[in-house]
């Protein structure tokens, strides 16, 4: 999916009002410096591409994020504010339902959510200094 035509300000508002708090709740008890940055993004569409990938694509050691509260709210925000996004996700959602497993918070998941926090911060960053 190409995130170029999303309403970035509306997505930013959704992040600031709820998604950010849900990410903090998930990470509670973890030091903010515990994980180094291992993923970045270079503009708002790119950030959403990487956020979608980390949030909804199962990875080795962390297959369970898609059912977390922050993930469901992320999915809702993208569906509302990114034209045509929900249509592209129907097949992915069906596959996810078949895969649904017991919820386990692993260290790998904590690391992944830490990276998500970093990506969201970059998405919401103010303009850099004029170089």
């Amino acid at each position: 999916y190409d995130f170029t035509n999303c309403d970035f300000e509306k997505i930013k508002a959704a992040y600031l009002s709820t998604i950010s708090k849900d990410l903090i709740t998930y990470m509670s008890g973890t030091k903010s410096t515990e994980f180094n940055n291992t993923v970045s993004c270079s503009n708002r569409p790119h950030c959403l591409t990487e956020i979608q990938s980390l949030t909804f694509n199962p990875t080795a050691g962390c297959a369970s994020l898609a059912k977390e509260m922050f993930a469901m709210k992320t999915k809702a925000a993208l569906a509302i504010w990114c034209p045509g996004y929900s249509e592209t996700q129907i097949n992915a959602t069906q596959a996810m339902k078949k895969r649904r497993k017991r919820k386990v918070t692993t260290n790998k998941c904590l690391e992944q959510v830490s990276q998500l926090q970093g990506l969201w911060r970059r998405f919401n960053r103010p303009l850099l200094k004029q170089q």
Partner: antibody, heavy 122, light 108 residues
Framework: QMQLVESGGGVVQPGRSLRLSCAAS????????MHWVRQAPGKGLEWVAV????????HYADSVKGRFTITRDNSKNTLNLQMNSLRAEDTAVYYC???????????????WGQGTMVTVSS | SYVLTQPPSVSVAPGQTARITCGGN??????VHWYQQKPGQAPVLVVY???DRPSWIPERFSGSNSGNTATLTISRGEAGDEADYYC???????????FGGGTKLTVL
């Protein structure tokens, strides 16, 4: 653990070519801009080239433009520097480094390799 | 092209504060990054975006930037701080990275 490992350095005659490689591991390579920086013996750091996170744009220092080519392969997590028409003044330790970027602005180089020595001598 | 000017050397007594400057035309409008390099080793980022510090760098390292001068401040200097220090910016007008000439810090 995040790591950059350079290879390909060595001794080469003036006018000849050399290809350096940088293998990245421990981070999502395709999301970072990547640089080559060099340091001549006893001298300071000199920036050589940068390639965008997706390979869509490239910039070179004036001293190497037209002779050096920076490339990346995001499927293999590798960065390369093809060095042609080498000169004695290209003798240096060559480092690769990663850099987050925002739009067309490159940020700090937060991870560096250990460097590979290139000596251009007849 | 944009030029960054650093003093070749700075010395500090153990426990005292060292300040390394980096001069450039209206450098306060740019984001400045600082690197530490010890002999035979690769550079290490110590301060980025003028004053931010990577999580692995001690709080003794800090930075500031305004007008025509950026400054790296190292408080309570230690023997282990002896190294070369480089400032760096991204120059959008030329699409080039620019490094300062480097400053050798000596802890007396």
């Amino acid at each position: 653990q995040m790591q950059l490992v350079e290879s390909g350095g060595g001794v080469v005659q003036p006018g000849r070519s050399l290809r350096l490689s940088c293998a990245a591991s421990g981070f999502t390579f395709r999301t970072y801009g990547m640089h080559w920086v060099r340091q001549a013996p006893g001298k300071g750091l000199e920036w050589v080239a940068v390639v965008w996170y997706d390979g869509s744009d490239i910039h070179y220092a004036d001293s190497v433009k037209g002779r050096f080519t920076i490339t990346r392969d995001n499927s293999k997590n590798t960065l390369n520097l093809q060095m042609n028409s080498l000169r004695a003044e290209d003798t240096a330790v060559y480092y690769c480094s990663r850099s987050p970027q925002w739009e067309d602005i490159f940020e700090s180089m937060d991870i560096w390799g250990q460097g590979t020595m290139v000596t251009v001598s007849s | 092209s944009y030029v960054l000017t650093q003093p070749p050397s700075v010395s500090v007594a153990p426990g005292q504060t060292a300040r390394i400057t980096c001069g450039g035309n209206n450098i306060g409008s740019k984001s400045v990054h600082w690197y530490q390099q010890k002999p035979g080793q690769a550079p290490v980022l110590v301060v980025y975006d003028d004053s931010d510090r990577p999580s692995w760098i001690p709080e003794r390292f800090s930075g500031s930037n305004s007008g025509n001068t950026a400054t790296l401040t190292i408080s309570r200097g230690e023997a282990g701080d002896e190294a070369d220090y480089y400032c760096q910016i991204w120059d959008s007008s030329s699409d080039h990275v620019v490094f300062g000439g480097g400053t050798k810090l000596t802890v007396l």
